[in-house]
Interface confidence: low
Amino acid sequence: ALDAAYCFRNVQDNCCLRPLYIDFKRDLGWKWIHEPKGYNANFCAGACPYLWSSDTQHTKVLSLYNTINPEASASPCCVSQDLEPLTILYYIGNTPKIEQLSNMIVKSCKCS
Amino acid sequence: ALDAAYCFRNVQDNCCLRPLYIDFKRDLGWKWIHEPKGYNANFCAGACPYLWSSDTQHTKVLSLYNTINPEASASPCCVSQDLEPLTILYYIGNTPKIEQLSNMIVKSCKCS
């Protein structure tokens, strides 16, 4: 799996999970989230050569097409596969609210 | 939806469905598929600005992060959303076989 266990331990130019810390105020301009201040969102990036963690049959077709036709603009892209939620604390007036924001943390990647 | 009905009728730089015809022999080097000779595979391409057909909350976060930090390498990517199968005819010896290859045709796209 193209997850932290693999990607953070290997120098990998191909599609892999990359570390990314997001500070809500600084990076997004969000002031409404009280806790946490930020979180390890991570992101996916890297090349998608033929058969490199292909998501679907179409991805395989596209990467093979791109290999044979390298000048073509059609090529697969490295995107998130497994995501996890993030629990946040915010206030409505003086009342603290806890909410789970789904799909906030990328845990692994794929070529799609 | 970023499908043919919208994307093929509009000039759209942002993430959208793009037409792509794949010839099995010419483009993939596949000689084993007897029918069809090729098919409209389509593909997804284009920019993913903030809130443009975002797949997940993480995609929204990433595109907003990319807006505020345009030099960052972390940005969402335009990929396939809905896919359809393709029915093919091939031969094993002299015996014709019909098979449905899943996820071969892209019908719509998303930013992920």
Epitope: Y21, E35, P36, K37, G38, L86, T87, L89, P96, I98 | -
Partner: antibody, heavy 118, light 108 residues
Framework: QVQLVQSGAEVKKPGESLKISCKGS????????VAWVRQMPGKGLEWMGW????????RYSPSFQGQVTISADKSISTAYLQWSSLKASDTAMYYC???????????WGQGTLVTVSS | SYELTQPLSVSVALGQTARITCSGD??????AHWYQQKPGQAPVLVIY???DRPSGIPERFSGSNSGNTATLTISRAQAGDEADYYC??????????FGGGTKLTVLG
Amino acid sequence: QVQLVQSGAEVKKPGESLKISCKGSGYSFTRYYVAWVRQMPGKGLEWMGWIDPGQSNTRYSPSFQGQVTISADKSISTAYLQWSSLKASDTAMYYCARMLAWGWFDYWGQGTLVTVSS
Amino acid sequence: SYELTQPLSVSVALGQTARITCSGDNLGGYYAHWYQQKPGQAPVLVIYDKSDRPSGIPERFSGSNSGNTATLTISRAQAGDEADYYCASYDSSLMMVFGGGTKLTVLG
């Protein structure tokens, strides 16, 4: 003024059940979370979990999930910590605390000492 | 699971400055809070949100937090400052965690 008053010390035998309490006063009880913190003899503080008395939402530390139950009765502004079957290793001081945000407890109860011994 | 690491003990001469550290992965990205606990008493909040003091806590107590380390600084240390000090924060799943505690001894 804000106060959290806990129930008195308890001496129990292994296998017995127990429910200790924490009564809040001087503030709107349903507006703030109540957390429970364990301190074993001579050891440090351990967060056990919290409850939102307004909604009765709870969250437990993985170490305490399934070992204890946190509840609240907002009509009497009281939070509870209970065990269905005590073990000797549950011997500790238990504190409740008003929680403003993660890790941020501004008022604490005086503590309830629980001793489990055969 | 997320861990916060503190020194077991710190000694400071009367009237001097004591610094107690708390380290954890990317701790600077989260809020860190500090508690003082004297023998036989409940903990007391002395610093919250990295560097803010609750009312009633002397200005001698201050906090900072960056990188992987939060620091509690007690200037002009007094005998009454002798206590156990705990840092507290949380991980990305918002599971709260306390440091192991540091025993502060004021010498002289």
